[in-house]
């Protein structure tokens, strides 16, 4: 069955950024990925990267740098440029549309009692979507 | 099938403004972008900037910060671009596109002229 | 910004002629993590706008005749017409599509000899 995880990791040189790490495991070829925030995409989430493996990358504020780390697996480095830190309690999705498969989403966040530089552990959550 | 339709030729004078918009169909206009582009005769093709309607999102080249300011209407499933302080050097041709490019208008051409 | 360079500005040819032009661009368009290049090549023509042909470097948007070869990885990039129809007679545009912003080349416009 595939599978999606996330990880929310703080920098621990600069504590106002933040990298969300999403990857895909299962069969089927990646057609794209969207990293939403707040909720999953479509359900109360905030857009912040589409990337198509192929064409390109979308990115927008407070997103940094999307990039793909893998074939199936990508990047997204946020900038806090407020004083407060909102990305510690907010929630991070990745949706990864693969054929023939499907659209799969999973969430993450980063934990409370993260130390600098820790990630969070995998967190599987399918939210399955025959898309 | 994926269709970007633009409003029409515009005729305006220096100093002005104008919006010009952008009415998508066939795909979910929340889900992409709407870049827009900028197209003089040997000149080629300009990156202005982007918006992604629903959050209303922006990225503007920084040579057009100040010129473009992007807007989008997810109830009727159109973007527009208005262009302030309107000189010559503004008359082009003006592409919507979605899709990472893969989809484009049919242009608008704005002429700026006294 | 990546700077776009493409070469030669104008090409005159043959019906049948195999034709070559060049893209170069000022930084790599290679994503390591998962060895794509982010380069797309855009024909138009007289009072048209841009068509997608290649993207990826490579892979040839769905309808485009399978003549149009797109080549090339990092900075060096190629677009081959393997034989010139004239319906190919147009504007040649290849772009960066690795990094914000966008930016595109001036062009290489194909004429008939």
């Known amino acids: 069955t595939p599978e999606v995880w996330v990880q929310v990791q703080m920098e621990a040189t600069e504590l106002s950024s933040f990298t969300v790490h999403c990857g895909f495991l299962g069969p089927g070829s990646i057609s794209l990925v969207t990293v939403s925030w707040g909720g999953p995409d479509g359900a109360g989430g905030t857009k912040l990267a589409v990337l198509h493996p192929e064409l390109g990358t979308r990115q927008w504020a407070p997103a940094r740098q999307a990039r793909w780390e893998t074939q199936s697996s990508i990047s997204l480095a946020l900038e806090d440029s407020g004083a407060s830190s909102p990305f510690a309690n907010t929630t991070f999705c990745c949706k990864f549309a693969s054929f023939p498969e499907g659209s799969w989403e999973s969430c993450g966040s980063l934990p409370p009692s993260s130390d600098p530089g820790l990630s969070a552990p995998p967190t599987p959550v399918p939210i399955l979507r025959a898309d | 099938q994926v269709q970007l339709q633009q409003s029409g030729a515009e005729l305006v004078k220096p100093g002005a403004s104008v919006k010009i918009s952008c009415k998508a169909t066939?795909?979910?206009?929340?889900?992409?972008?709407i870049e827009w582009v900028k197209q003089r005769p040997g000149h080629g093709l300009a990156w202005i900037g982007e918006?992604?309607?629903?959050?209303?999102?922006?990225n503007y080249n920084e040579k057009f910060k100040g010129k473009a300011t992007f807007t989008a209407d997810t109830s009727s499933n159109t973007a527009y671009m208005q262009l302030s302080s309107l000189t010559s050097e503004d008359s082009a041709v003006y592409y919507c596109?979605?899709?990472?490019?893969?989809?484009w208008g049919q242009g608008t051409l704005v002429t700026v002229s006294a | 910004d990546i700077v776009m360079t493409q070469s030669p500005s104008s090409l005159s040819v043959s019906a049948g002629e195999k034709v070559t032009m060049s893209c170069k661009s000022s930084?790599?368009?290679?994503?390591?993590?998962?060895?794509?290049?982010?380069l797309a090549w855009y024909q138009q023509k007289p009072g048209q706008p841009p068509k997608l042909l290649i993207y990826?470097?490579?892979t040839r948007e769905s309808g485009v005749p399978d003549r149009f070869t797109g080549s090339g990885s990092g900075t060096d990039f190629t677009l081959t017409i393997s034989s010139v129809q004239a319906e190919d007679l147009a504007v040649y545009y290849c772009?960066?599509?690795?990094?914000?912003?966008?930016t595109f080349a001036a062009g290489t416009k194909l004429e008939l000899k």
């Open positions: 990826g470097a490579s």
């Open positions: 596109s979605s899709y990472w490019f893969a989809y």
């Open positions: 930084q790599s368009l290679l994503n390591s993590g998962n060895q794509k290049n982010y």
């Open positions: 066939g795909y979910t206009f929340s889900s992409f972008s």
């Open positions: 918006i992604l309607p629903g959050s209303n999102s922006t």
């Open positions: 772009q960066n599509a690795h990094s914000y912003p966008p």
